[in-house]
Interface confidence: medium
């Protein structure tokens, strides 16, 4: 496996589809199955997922999909005869099959010249048949996730094995192991490999101990290691933070609930472009930081950090990473300042109630149409709306 692309080679967004994130192998998923390793095959096109064409579905594609999803191989690769539309049968374990759907003319096909995901390509509008859907049940119902880290790309490492989610012990857990996790999840590369208690402890079995990845493995279960041992408890659950995880902070204000908006993404702190910083984005950030709601969006100062992140929220999201976002690595925010926010929980809001004639207040004009006053001449007040 090649090393993940360094940050300056990636321009991505939450909505892009033509660009595959580091670690992503095939833009496919399985739906309506008994687990993440069985079901109807769907292919990502533009911003939507479309069912894959059943007529062009074969054992090589089935094998490649199962491998790409970290589900082992397809146990049996023969294609079942199309079922009758009235009563589609449940998929046989380990079989590829097609399910009826009358609307799939012009559907995308997954064409593979071998059973490896690198040998596959997605061909749009390839299907010219009776609209059968491709289905597969893979051999290994294995899956991986990061939990309790505030997003899909950070948290406690959990594996699904034998139908149960369980932890990985942090003995010998290092950045190479975390790299494999991040890449497998399509979360870029590992920024941190964390020992136990950085995230909440797990509850289920401990599936792995003494994990020792080279960093080149496609799946965590391909790494050398031992089954979970009795002496490894949940206080030793391994964790990871990947480059695609976003975390936020406010700097330069009176406290953690006021200041310049900074996002940690791909290993560095970035400023956020204020050209798309509206009440809904500010509201989501304040709430996600536990700082109440947004009260002010002061006009920012010039970017002190690399400013490349844009967000667009409807105001109902739990975090900014759930909003539509765009990270532009080739340009700093054009004609933009660094976004700032004052949240309702900031102590500056409660301490700075202006009396009718404020004491020791200096009013300073910074630019036309905007004035800011400095209480006790503290530089933190140099923020403009």
């Amino acid at each position: 496996h090649p090393s993940p692309a360094p940050p300056d080679q990636l321009n991505t967004s939450s909505a892009e589809s033509e660009l595959w994130e580091p670690g992503e192998r095939l833009p496919v998923r399985l739906t309506n199955g008994s687990s993440s390793c069985s079901g109807t095959v769907e292919v990502r096109l533009e911003a939507s997922w479309e069912p894959a064409c059943g007529a062009l579905w074969d054992s090589r594609a089935a094998e490649a999909v199962c491998r790409a999803l970290g589900c082992g191989g397809a146990e049996a690769a023969s294609q079942l005869a199309p079922p009758t539309p009235e009563l589609p049968p449940p998929p046989a374990a380990g079989n590829t099959s097609v399910a009826a759907n009358a609307t799939l003319a012009g559907a995308p096909a997954l064409l593979c010249s071998g059973a490896e995901w690198r040998l596959c390509e997605v061909v749009e509008h390839a299907c010219r048949s009776d609209g059968r859907r491709a289905r597969v049940t893979c051999a290994e119902n294995r899956a991986l996730r990061l939990v309790d880290g505030g997003g899909a790309c950070a948290g406690r490492v959990e594996m699904l094995e034998h139908g149960e989610w369980g932890s990985v012990c942090d003995d010998t857990w290092d950045l190479e192991d975390a790299h494999v996790v991040c890449r497998q999840l399509g979360c870029g590369w590992a920024v941190q490999a964390l020992p136990g208690l950085h995230f909440t402890p797990g509850r289920g079995p401990i599936h792995r101990d003494q994990v020792n990845c080279s960093g080149a493995e496609a799946y965590l279960w391909d790494c050398p290691g031992l089954p979970g041992q009795h002496y490894c408890g949940h206080k030793e659950d391994a964790g990871a933070v990947c480059s695609e995880h976003q975390s936020w902070r406010l700097t330069g204000g009176a406290d953690r609930c006021e200041g310049q908006v900074e996002v940690h993404f791909r290993g560095v702190w970035n400023t956020v472009c204020d050209s798309e910083w509206y009440p809904s984005e500010a509201k989501v950030l304040c709430q996600s930081l536990g700082c109440g709601t947004a009260v002010e969006r002061p006009k920012g100062l010039p970017h002190s950090l690399s400013g490349r992140m844009y967000y667009s929220c409807n105001g109902e999201e739990l975090t900014l990473s759930n909003c539509s976002w765009r990270f532009n690595n080739s340009n700093l925010c054009s004609q933009s300042l660094a976004a700032r926010v004052l949240c309702s929980a900031s102590r500056s809001l409660h301490n700075l109630s202006t009396p009718e004639v404020p004491a020791s207040v200096q009013t300073v004009t910074i630019e036309s149409s905007v004035t800011v006053k400095i209480e006790n001449k503290e530089s933190r007040e140099l923020m403009l709306l």
Partner: antibody, heavy 119, light 107 residues
Framework: EVQLVESGGGLVKPGGSLKLSCAAS????????MSWVRQAPGKRLEWVAT????????YYPDSVKGRFTISRDNVKNTLYLQMSSLRSEDTAMYYC????????????WGQGTLVTVSS | DIQMTQSPSSLSASVGDRVTITCKAS??????LTWYQQKPGKAPKTLIY???SLADGVPSRFSGSGSGQDYSLTISSLESDDTATYYC?????????LGSGTKLEIK
Amino acid sequence: EVQLVESGGGLVKPGGSLKLSCAASGFKFSRYAMSWVRQAPGKRLEWVATISSGGSYIYYPDSVKGRFTISRDNVKNTLYLQMSSLRSEDTAMYYCARRDYDLDYFDSWGQGTLVTVSS
Amino acid sequence: DIQMTQSPSSLSASVGDRVTITCKASRDIRSYLTWYQQKPGKAPKTLIYYATSLADGVPSRFSGSGSGQDYSLTISSLESDDTATYYCLQHGESPFTLGSGTKLEIK
């Protein structure tokens, strides 16, 4: 019920000063940013000044900068506009307006107080 | 500053007519737009906020639409009580800016 009542308007000579007040009731005054908006006779509405809920952020358009000062007293639930070096073009009805907490628009207005600058 | 271009500046229509007033922002304001109604000698009254949301107590004949730079206020069936001046306000970016107003008269 939200109520905003302006006072302090009147006749003043050019170059003179005047202080407007806006008494707020029916809501938690200290939670809301407040603004003054004016309207000259027969003319469009014009934003004059805004002060944030805690008073730490203050904004003016160029037309009044250096002459007008907005302030607030969150204990007395009152908004003020100190106007000096008044000009004839400052003649207008002055409204105080409350700014919505989430969406930032002016959601409640007072009935206004008339300021006439004339010799 | 964001400029708001409102049109028409005045219009005359009959009771029962459908009337539309438009506002164009100099750049995308992401639906942070409010429509106000002002009657002579009275304070402005909020009709529509966030481009499309009807304010409390406002009759359903008023509606707002639009996104990006272009927005409109529609009165589906004009009533005599609708004689007033209508203003748009963008509140996505400070300084907030207002349209020049549309004076609506009943024929």
